[in-house]
C-alpha cells in the first residue's frame, strides 16, 4: 500500500484551524490477522531521510496521537487530547487520516509526518509515510484563510478546518 | 481501564497439565494486538510462553512448542494456557499481559499474576 | 534466542543520586532506525510495570527521572534523581525476535 499527501504545503493565518490529510490507498489486505498503526508527528527537513526524526506536536507525542484498529474501520484520539492541546487526529472508512490544530501560532510551523504501519500477525510490519509543511503567518502578509498547496500541482487552494 | 486477571489452580502434581485462564475486562481480545502468557521463576527469571493474536492465531516460545497451547473464548473475553506434561520446573508465577505497538513491541498491561507450584 | 545481560546484578545507590543500569543483547534489536528495547520495573508481590519502551519513550504516566538510551545492542536506563520509592527490580526485555526474551534483572536498593 502507500501513502499520500493531498497538499505539500500548507499556510495559514495565526489563530485559524486547519486540518492536515493523507490517505492510504493500494492494496489492503482487510483480514483478521492486519492492524493498522496510524499516527502523526513533527520532523525536521535537511536530514538523509524525510520523517526519521520523530518530535511531539504541541508536547503530544506519536502515541499520544496514534490511531490503531483494523482496516479500514473508523477512528479517532480521545476527545480530550482535542480539549486540552487544540489536536484531533481521526480516520475514516476510505482510507484518509487527518489532524486537525485548533488556533495556530507560529511556534506550530514546521514538518509535520502521517505514518500508517500495517502490522501483520506475528508482529511484522510494513511502514509508510507523508510528510507536508506547515506555515503559519502573521501580519499583513498572512492569507486571510489557510491555502493549501497541492503535492502534484502548484494550483491553490482554499481549505478550512471542519 | 483495560484489567487482566489470572486463575487456575495453586497445585499441579507432575506429568499432569497445568490449565489457566486469563479473563479481560475493558477491552475485547478481537480488538487489540496479541494477548500473553509470560511466567516468572522462583529465582526471578522471566519467560515470554507464547501468545494468541486478535484473530486466534498463535505463536509459541520454541523451548516450549511441544508442551504449549494458547486458546481462546471471545463470548467470555478470556484466553487460556495449557501447559503439558508438567515437571517441578514449571513452578513459577504465571502472568499474562497485553502486548502494544509504539516503534517497540511492550506488555503495556499485565495481570497481578497467579503462583503455581508443580508438586507431588 | 536473544540473550539480554544486565549489569550490574545489583547497586545501592543514595537518595538524590543517579541509577544507571546496563543491558547488553547478543545481537542488535534494532530496526528501521528504532530499538525495539523496553525496560519494566518490578517490586515485590506486583507484576512488572512498563517505563519505557523503544529504548527512549517514556510511557505514559511514569515520572521523567527515569530516562532510557542507546541503540543497536548497548542500552541504559537511567534513574535520576532516585527517590525511595524507587526501590525494585529493573528489567530490560527485547522485541525484535521470536522469542521475545528478558534480562536477568538489576536489584535497586536505596541508601
Known amino acids: 500500500f502507500k501513502v499520500a499527501t493531498l497538499y505539500s504545503l500548507y499556510v495559514c493565518p495565526e489563530g485559524q484551524n486547519v486540518t492536515l490529510t493523507c490517505r492510504f490507498f493500494g492494496p489492503v489486505d482487510k483480514g483478521h490477522d492486519v492492524t493498522f498503526y496510524k499516527t502523526w508527528y513533527r520532523s525536521s527537513r535537511g536530514e538523509v531521510q524525510t520523517c526519521s526524526e520523530r518530535r511531539p506536536i504541541r508536547n503530544l507525542t506519536f502515541q499520544d496521537l496514534h490511531l490503531h484498529h483494523g482496516g479500514h474501520q473508523a477512528a479517532n484520539t480521545s476527545h480530550d487530547l482535542a480539549q486540552r492541546h487544540g489536536l484531533e487526529s481521526a480516520s475514516d472508512h476510505h482510507g484518509n487520516f487527518s489532524i486537525t490544530m485548533r488556533n495556530l501560532t507560529l511556534l506550530d510551523s514546521g514538518l509535520y509526518c502521517c505514518l500508517v504501519v500495517e502490522i501483520r500477525h506475528h508482529h511484522s510490519e510494513h511502514r509508510v509515510h507523508g510528510a507536508m509543511e506547515l506555515q503559519v503567518q502573521t501580519g499583513k502578509d498572512a492569507p486571510s484563510s489557510c491555502v493549501a498547496y497541492p503535492s502534484s500541482s502548484q494550483e491553490s487552494e482554499n481549505i478550512t478546518a471542519a | 481501564d483495560v484489567q487482566l486477571q489470572e486463575s487456575g489452580p495453586d497445585l499441579v502434581k507432575p506429568s499432569q497439565s497445568l490449565s489457566l485462564t486469563c479473563t479481560v475486562t475493558?477491552?475485547?481480545?478481537?480488538?487489540?494486538?496479541?494477548w500473553h502468557w509470560i511466567r516468572q521463576f522462583p529465582g526471578n527469571k522471566l519467560e515470554w510462553m507464547g501468545d494468541i493474536h486478535k484473530s486466534g492465531s498463535t505463536n509459541y516460545n520454541p523451548s516450549l512448542k511441544s508442551r504449549i497451547s494458547i486458546t481462546r473464548d471471545t463470548s467470555k473475553n478470556q484466553f487460556f494456557l495449557q501447559l503439558n506434561s508438567v515437571t517441578t520446573e514449571d513452578t513459577a508465577t504465571y502472568y499474562c499481559?497485553?502486548?502494544?505497538?509504539?516503534?517497540?513491541?511492550?506488555?503495556?498491561?499485565w495481570g497481578a499474576g497467579t503462583t503455581v507450584t508443580v508438586s507431588s | 534466542d536473544i540473550v539480554l545481560t544486565q549489569s550490574p546484578a545489583s547497586l545501592a545507590v543514595s537518595l538524590g543520586q543517579r541509577a544507571t543500569i546496563s543491558c547488553k543483547a547478543s545481537q542488535s534489536v534494532d530496526y528501521d532506525g528504532d530499538s525495539y528495547m523496553n525496560w519494566y520495573q518490578q517490586k515485590p508481590g506486583q507484576p512488572p510495570k512498563l517505563l519505557i519502551y523503544?529504548?527512549?519513550n517514556l510511557e505514559s504516566g511514569i515520572p521523567a527521572r527515569f530516562s532510557g538510551s542507546g541503540s543497536g545492542r548497548d542500552f541504559t536506563l537511567n534513574i535520576h534523581p532516585v527517590e525511595e520509592e524507587d526501590a525494585a527490580t529493573y528489567y530490560c526485555q527485547q522485541s525484535i525476535e521470536d522469542p521475545w526474551t528478558f534480562g536477568g534483572g538489576t536489584k535497586l536498593e536505596i541508601k
Open positions: 523503544g529504548a527512549s
Open positions: 475493558g477491552y475485547s481480545i478481537t480488538g487489540g494486538y496479541n
Open positions: 499481559a497485553r502486548d502494544y505497538y509504539g516503534f517497540s513491541w511492550y506488555f503495556d498491561v
